[in-house]
Amino acid sequence: VSPTFQVVNSIAPVQECSTQLDIVIVLDGSNSIYPWDSVTAFLNDLLERMDIGPKQTQVGIVQYGANVTHEFNLNKYSSTEEVLVAAKKIVQRGGRQTMTALGIDTARKEAFTEARGARRGVKKVMVIVTDGESHDNHRLKKVIQDCEDENIQRFSIAILGSYNRGNLSTEKFVEEIKSIASEPTEKHFFNVSDELALVTIVKTLGERIFALEA
């Protein structure tokens, strides 16, 4: 503000994540996720809020179903623009199985390694997006504990679309996905009515991720 109380420069509230984080997004790519472009739209809206680069935030993406695919590593791209282009091109791998424990464990053991771009001393964040109970849920408790031991902050998102389409109870599913989220659960767990609604949680999810380095 000038001596005459005129606004000379204004700084917009910080909406971007301009801090150092290593974020791995773990996507359920099984057939029941429909339509897939709702997932890529969600990725686009989330990633465009991030200041991505080798000295800022890094993002890697893992897709799982019956098995796991590294879509791209943390150190693959060095700008938000590059990551946005790559994320848009991610195709749904399909399959009927939802091996969520395998997806999370692979992200922990492989995606968060220095070989794939993870940086020492940088906070690790995992975002898990799924629409069904895991077929390997007997492994989940240990897998989550392993993440906890490695200080990986976890945000989990339950898509209720396939349950609502089939008029099925979501209770057991929601409990499972809540168990994946870090404490406090209410700050780390989200659920959406269907895939189209994923974009509605981007702002809040982004703010909570960014708050980790506030």
């Epitope: 057939n31 029941s32 429909y34 791998r93 399909g94 399959g95 009927r96 396939s162 389409r165």
Partner: antibody, heavy 124, light 108 residues
Framework: EVQLVQSGAEVKKPGESLRISCKGS????????IGWVRQMPGKGLEWMGI????????RYSPSFQGQVTISADKSISTAYLQWSSLKASDTAMYYC??????????????????WGQGTLVTVS | EIVLTQSPGTLSLSPGERATLSCRAS???????LAWYQQKPAQAPRLLIY???RRATGIPDRFSGSGSGTDFTLTISRLEPEDFAVYYC?????????FGQGTTVEIK
């Protein structure tokens, strides 16, 4: 590149059996449902049934249940449509198409994003 | 079973004109699970639109879909010579797939 390649045209007599095929490539064939669609001469499209090649789970349209058999051989990424006894009214173009969506838990949904070139079956 | 009725049966238009195709369902289509396909003579159908309004990969933006519930519309903003074909709507919200009878867009 995703491709569905169907077997060639067939001319058959009433009462004969027939199996036509649809071979997928360019994607994980065992991970997507494949549907079959009939188009009678000069007419519209009719959904016949659908199969998941990964485990051969199959669903039929009530109109085609018992009239045809849908099967798959995942080792060669191929789905099949077969008749045990053809009728003149089976004369049509038959298309296979990949389902972007799912068919489990009693609920089916999704659109057909890639189609085969069609197999013309003539019964006379 | 949901019955889809397309209108008009035939649409006679000139290149450059706007085409509006209608698809009416006998009962509400859940989650707007409706697709549009284009079929040219001696060719397989091609996906244009899914979930009522989302354009399939590689489909020009002159094609747009709208609607929900029981009434859906496919609009071609400016007809190109290659757009003259038969168009089918299809619903997929009831554990089966049903198609409309088709609308033929022909050159006037």
């Amino acid at each position: 590149e995703v491709q569905l390649v169907q077997s060639g045209a067939e001319v058959k007599k009433p009462g004969e059996s027939l199996r036509i095929s649809c071979k997928g490539s360019g994607y994980s064939v065992t991970s997507y449902w494949i549907g079959w669609v009939r188009q009678m001469p000069g007419k519209g499209l009719e959904w016949m049934g659908i199969i998941y090649p990964g485990d051969s789970d199959t669903r039929y349209s009530p109109s085609f249940q018992g009239q045809v058999t849908i099967s798959a051989d995942k080792s060669i990424s191929t789905a099949y449509l077969q008749w045990s006894s053809l009728k003149a009214s089976d004369t049509a173009m038959y298309y296979c198409a990949r389902l972007q969506g799912d068919c489990s838990g009693g609920t089916c949904y999704g659109h057909f994003d890639y189609w085969g070139q069609g197999t013309l079956v003539t019964v006379s | 079973e949901i019955v889809l009725t397309q209108s008009p049966g035939t649409l006679s238009l000139s290149p450059g004109e706007r085409a509006t195709l209608s698809c009416r369902a006998s009962q509400s289509v859940s989650s707007s699970y409706l697709a549009w396909y284009q079929q040219k003579p001696a060719q397989a159908p091609r996906l244009l639109i899914y979930v009522a309004s989302r354009r399939a990969t590689g489909i020009p933006d002159r094609f747009s879909g709208s609607g929900s519930g029981t009434d859906f519309t496919l609009t071609i903003s400016r007809l190109e010579p290659e757009d003259f074909a038969v168009y089918y709507c299809q619903q997929y919200g009831t554990s089966s797939w049903t198609f409309g009878q088709g609308t033929t867009v022909e050159i006037k």
